[in-house]
């Protein structure tokens, strides 16, 4: 087990602040919630704090909870892959480009790591080249999320790791927003990280709405699992 | 309140070295690019070097082999090693702090190389 590894196992509160600028629409969100890397479950709730938001609350998911994925559930014989968690308690940095077919780009930056007891992930992210009246902008993306594979593998020369995937929006008239993710991962501190094999995370999200909340905001359960490597030789003939 | 702090500054000989501090609150340190400018009298200020978020370091021709960026985020601090110190050197050296939305400027450490 790493020593971050040691963090995760219980249920731990999670805070997620981001700052916003879409085509010049500002925003800021404000998350919390909790997470359970025995089960790789995350229950979060999103507020937009600067009014309505500009964007569809699914474009941001990978923003947010991809964010943590110190949370995915790693199976015992993946675990000396489990780099989000090895990085813990100082972190990692988080950098993506989003790219959505036929219209803009989103550029994010984060700050994953605990204070306190607490998991914080503090983001920036940039969007530009959005078209007004496309499926960002012009808020035509169904309000639900598929399941997807996010992969990964390692970056021995930056001692991180490169991610990479892509996401399938559900769009109003029954067609697809395709937005291909880019992601490196970058530790916080100089202390050794677990550098994984290939491998990919299966993710499962679900969107809903809180009935007493009055402010633009999203609910989010999200499952992770660790999968793409199997046993070696010595567990099959045990 | 964002605050970038640079220190160690001086006066020294044809040569010498100097290692430049740069300190920075209220901003989330980690995920911005770091840079350390220099502008000497009666010249525009150019980049120096800087450091990404990722750790990739990037130097101008001139300091090449002689400067060393590098930071650590522990302490929310970005450094510049001075090596072999030249004349051409001296000038006014400011740390900047830019993310993807925001861009912050110290107000500066006077580097003065002479004999």
């Known amino acids: 087990m790493s020593k971050g590894e040691e963090l995760f196992t219980g249920v731990v509160p999670i805070l997620v602040e981001l700052d916003g600028d879409v085509n010049g629409h500002k925003f800021s969100v404000s998350g919390e919630g909790e997470g359970d890397a025995t089960y790789g479950k995350l229950t979060l709730k999103f507020i937009c704090t600067t009014g309505k938001l500009p964007v569809p609350w699914p474009t941001l998911v990978t923003t947010f909870s991809y964010g943590v994925q110190c949370f995915s559930r790693y199976p015992d014989h993946m675990k000396q892959h489990d780099f989000f968690k090895s990085a813990m308690p100082e972190g990692y940095v988080q950098e993506r480009t989003i790219f959505f077919k036929d219209d803009g780009n989103y550029k994010t930056r984060a700050e994953v790591k605990f204070e306190g007891d607490t998991l914080v992930n503090r983001i920036e992210l940039k969007g530009i080249d959005f078209k007004e009246d496309g499926n960002i902008l012009g808020h035509k993306l169904e309000y639900n999320y598929n399941s997807h594979n996010v992969y990964i593998m390692a970056d021995k020369q930056k001692n991180g790791i490169k991610v990479n995937f892509k996401i399938r929006h559900n769009i109003e008239d029954g067609s697809v927003q395709l937005a291909d993710h880019y992601q490196q991962n970058t530790p916080i501190g100089d202390g050794p990280v677990l550098l994984p094999d290939n491998h990919y995370l299966s993710t499962q999200s679900a969107l809903s709405k809180d009935p007493n909340e009055k402010r633009d905001h999203m609910v989010l359960l999200e499952f992770v699992t660790a999968a793409g490597i199997t046993h070696g030789m010595d567990e099959l003939y045990k | 309140d964002v605050q970038l702090q640079e220190s160690g500054g001086g006066l020294v000989q044809p040569g010498g070295s100097l290692r430049l501090s740069c300190a920075a609150s209220g901003i989330v340190f980690s995920i911005y690019d770091m840079g350390w400018h220099r502008q000497a009298p009666g010249k525009q200020r150019e980049l120096v070097a800087s450091i990404t978020s990722g750790k990739n370091t990037n130097y101008a021709d001139s300091v090449l082999g002689r400067l060393t960026i590098s930071r650590d985020n522990s302490k929310n601090t970005v450094y510049l090693q001075m090596n072999s110190l030249k004349p051409e050197d001296t000038a006014v050296y400011y740390c900047?702090?830019?993310?993807?939305?925001?861009?912050?400027w110290g107000q500066g450490t006077q580097v003065t190389v002479s004999s």
């Open positions: 900047n702090a830019r993310s993807l939305l925001y861009d912050y």
